[in-house]
């Protein structure tokens, strides 16, 4: 199956790479604008220059294009704990990230929130914290993993998953009590 091409892609595919078809005259191929610039006026004829203008402050284009407007720079989402890694330039969007010892949790394709990496208290680090993944902890004996934290088996209720992990501990406690001498 051949994927369906949009009108713009169809028009572009007629011209060699780095050029696009003139919107009013499909016999003319105009040179695309460099990154950091946008299309102000199409080329007047074959072999003539396309009128490209530099993006204004607060906007960018990251690749060669024939856009009529530059794209607005992204803003880092402070309410998501994001910080600016590098600011927007005419040819590159703002890069947002998280602080040291934090990882990104993606709520959707383009939206992430920063969370603190787990420290694995009462356990050991099985896998270190990554840019997009929290630390993976392994808990010490007598502790079980709940919401990526090692919690004491004394907090394990019968209805919870932890009963399997804490069973030996619970049995030991019972055994000690039962075998008590008077």
């Amino acid at each position: 199956l051949v994927p369906h091409l949009g009108d713009r892609e169809k028009r572009d595919s007629v011209c060699p790479q780095g050029k696009y078809i003139h919107p009013q005259n499909n016999s003319i191929c105009c040179t695309k604008c460099h990154k950091g610039t946008y299309l102000y006026n199409d080329c007047p004829g074959p072999g003539q220059d396309t009128d490209c203008r530099e993006c204004e402050s607060g906007s960018f284009t990251a690749s060669e294009n024939h856009l009529r407007h530059c794209l607005s720079c992204s803003k880092c989402r402070k309410e998501m704990g994001q910080v600016e890694i590098s600011s927007c330039t005419v040819d590159r969007d703002t890069v947002c990230g998280c602080r040291k010892n934090q990882y990104r949790h993606y709520w959707s394709e383009n939206l992430f929130q920063c969370f603190n990496c787990s420290l694995c208290l009462n356990g050991t680090v099985h896998l270190s914290c990554q840019e997009k993944q929290n630390t993976v902890c392994t808990c010490h004996a007598g502790f079980f993993l709940r919401e990526n934290e090692c919690v004491s088996c004394s907090n394990c209720k019968k209805s919870l998953e932890c009963t399997k992990l804490c069973l030996p501990q619970i049995e030991n406690v019972k055994g000690t009590e039962d075998s008590g001498t008077t």
Partner: nanobody, 116 residues
């Protein structure tokens, strides 16, 4: 067929509490992050809170932080929003929504009115 049914709204005095529920069906609930979104009279939609698949990750809008708590019970296919210290500005229709990528499914909403 995907269905999201909100309940628990009503009239409450400032400073009061309400607990909203959203019963989900027609999809594997535990496979999706869920959200509460609200729309105040004559205003646009506002994110209230998100919750991740297992409930570990949560997000709250600054306007509700410290007052609202989102939770989920995957065994009951239900999303909750505990709302405490309610204010007049919390008056809105509250919707639960599935899949934060495209919000293709919404409930019909439940009205919360905070008034003395």
């Amino acid at each position: 067929e995907v269905q999201l049914l909100e309940s628990g709204g009503g009239l409450v005095q400032p400073g009061g509490s309400l607990r909203l529920s959203c019963a989900a069906s027609g999809f594997t609930f535990e496979d999706y992050p869920m959200a509460w979104v609200r729309q105040a009279p004559g205003k646009g939609l506002e994110w209230v809170s998100f919750i991740g698949l297992k409930g570990i990750h949560t997000y709250y809008a600054d306007s509700v932080k410290g007052r609202f708590t989102i939770s989920r019970d995957n065994s009951k296919n239900t999303l909750y929003l505990q709302m405490n210290s309610l204010r007049a500005e919390d008056t809105a229709v509250y919707y639960c929504a599935k899949d934060l990528n495209n919000f293709d499914y919404w409930g019909q909403g439940t009205l919360v009115t905070v008034s003395s």
